[in-house]
C-alpha cells in the first residue's frame, strides 16, 4: 500500500520504524567495540538533500548482503521488511532512482581491526559495525523525507 | 544556504607554518564529511585530506608528512595545519563538503598562500 | 593513484554547438554498480562547481543541457547546447580510490 504520505508515514511508522529499532535494539552493544575508521560506503552515499531516494535504494541493496549473516530468524526477518519495505516505499513516494545491478560483495572495513582478534571474529564485528551504521542512517533518511512530506 | 569562507592564507617564508581556517554555515556541520583541495597559478585541482563526521581522516600521501586536517564542530570549523612549506605550496586552497559520490558539492571562495622568501 | 586524463585539453566551440569532453582513468572507478566519477565547472578566479555526480547524475540546479556518461574507464561530459556561460573549464575527478584524482581539465573557449 502506498500511503506513506497519505497517511503521515504509517507505513513506515507500523512496519519499517519497528523492524529498525528491533535491529537496532538486538545491536545495543555494537558500538563500543567499533573503530572510528569511516566506511567507503559512508563516504560516498549520503543522505543529501534531494538525494535521499538514491542513498535509500543502495542502502537496501546493501542491507540484503546481511541477510543470513545472522543465526536468529528474528534478525533475518526484520532486516528482509526493512530492505523490501524501503524498495517498495521508495517506488511509492517516486524517490528512487536505481542505477545498474550490482554484483553483491561485503561490506568493506577501511582499515583492520585490533591484531589480537582472529580475523573471522574481526570481519564479523566489523560487518556488524557497518551493520548498525547503514540502520541509523536508513532511519535518519527516511525521518528526513517524512519531515519534507508533512511539510508540503 | 550552504556558505563555506575559508581564511588564514596569506604570505609565508618557507619552512614556516601556517593554519588555515573554514567556517561553515547553513548545514548540519557535523553530519558531514569535509575536504581541502588546492590550485596551483594556472594549474589544475589536487585532493589535500579529508575529515569524516567521526573525525577519522584521509589523506594524499604526498601531504600526511606535512598537513594536518581537523574540525571542531562546536564551532563549524574545519582546519589545515601546514608545516614546512615550500614554494610549490603556493596555490588558492579550497574547503568543500562532502557530496554524493564522495564529490565536492559545495566550494569555500579559496584563500591564497603564497610560500615566498 | 589512478590518473585521469581528459581530452582535449582545450577546444573552441561557437553558441549552440554541441561539446563532448572525455575523460579516462588508468584504472575501472566502478564499485557495486556505481561508476564513481564527477565533473565540475571552473570560470577563471571561482571556485570549481559541481555538474555531474556518479557519472551521470545531474547535480540539483545545473542546466539540462549538461550529461555525462560511461563506466569502468571510459567517461564523458556532454553539454547538448553550448550557452555563453559554458565557457570555462571542466575537470572529471575520480572518487573510487584514494587519493582521490582529477583530470588535467578542458578550456572551453569561443571559437
Known amino acids: 500500500d502506498c500511503d506513506i504520505e497519505g497517511k503521515d508515514g504509517k507505513q513506515y511508522e507500523s512496519v519499517l520504524m519497528v523492524s529498525i529499532d528491533q535491529l537496532l535494539d538486538s545491536m545495543k552493544e555494537i558500538g563500543s567495540n567499533c573503530l572510528n575508521n569511516e566506511f567507503n560506503f559512508f563516504k560516498r552515499h549520503i543522505c543529501d538533500a534531494n538525494k535521499e531516494g538514491m542513498f535509500l535504494f543502495r542502502a537496501a541493496r546493501k542491507l540484503r548482503q546481511f541477510l543470513k549473516m545472522n543465526s536468529t530468524g528474528d534478525f533475518d526477518l526484520h532486516l528482509l521488511k526493512v530492505s523490501e519495505g524501503t524498495t517498495i516505499l521508495l517506488n511509492c513516494t517516486g524517490q528512487v532512482k536505481g542505477r545498474k545491478p550490482a554484483a553483491l560483495g561485503e561490506a568493506q572495513p577501511t582499515k583492520s581491526l585490533e591484531e589480537n582478534k582472529s580475523l573471522k571474529e574481526q570481519k564479523k564485528l566489523n560487518d556488524l559495525c557497518f551493520l548498525k551504521r547503514l540502520l541509523q542512517e536508513i532511519k535518519t533518511c527516511w525521518n528526513k523525507i517524512l519531515m519534507g512530506t508533512k511539510e508540503h | 544556504q550552504v556558505q563555506l569562507v575559508e581564511s588564514g592564507g596569506g604570505v609565508v617564508q618557507p619552512g614556516r607554518s601556517l593554519r588555515l581556517s573554514c567556517a561553515a554555515s547553513g548545514f548540519t556541520f557535523s553530519s558531514y564529511g569535509l575536504h581541502w583541495v588546492r590550485q596551483a597559478p594556472g594549474k589544475g585541482l589536487e585532493w589535500l585530506a579529508a575529515i569524516w563526521t567521526g573525525g577519522s581522516t584521509d589523506y594524499n600521501a604526498a601531504f600526511i608528512s606535512r598537513f594536518t586536517i581537523s574540525r571542531d564542530n562546536s564551532k563549524n570549523t574545519l582546519y589545515l595545519q601546514m608545516n614546512s612549506l615550500r614554494a610549490e605550496d603556493t596555490a588558492v586552497y579550497y574547503c568543500?563538503?562532502?557530496?554524493?559520490?564522495?564529490?565536492?558539492?559545495?566550494w569555500g571562495q579559496g584563500t591564497l598562500v603564497t610560500v615566498s622568501s | 593513484d589512478i590518473q585521469m586524463t581528459q581530452s582535449p585539453s582545450s577546444l573552441s566551440a561557437s553558441v549552440g554547438d554541441r561539446v563532448t569532453i572525455t575523460c579516462k582513468a588508468s584504472q575501472s572507478v566502478d564499485d557495486d554498480g556505481d561508476s564513481f566519477i564527477n565533473w565540475y565547472q571552473q570560470k577563471p578566479g571561482k571556485a570549481p562547481k559541481l555538474l555531474i555526480y556518479v557519472a551521470s547524475n545531474l547535480e540539483s540546479g545545473v542546466p539540462a543541457r549538461f550529461s555525462g556518461s560511461g563506466s569502468g574507464t571510459d567517461f564523458t561530459l556532454t553539454i547538448s547546447s553550448l550557452q555563453p556561460e559554458d565557457f570555462a573549464t571542466y575537470y572529471c575527478q575520480q572518487s573510487n580510490e584514494d587519493p582521490l584524482t582529477f583530470g588535467g581539465g578542458t578550456k572551453v573557449e569561443i571559437k
Open positions: 568543500a563538503r562532502n557530496g554524493y559520490g564522495e564529490s565536492f558539492a559545495y
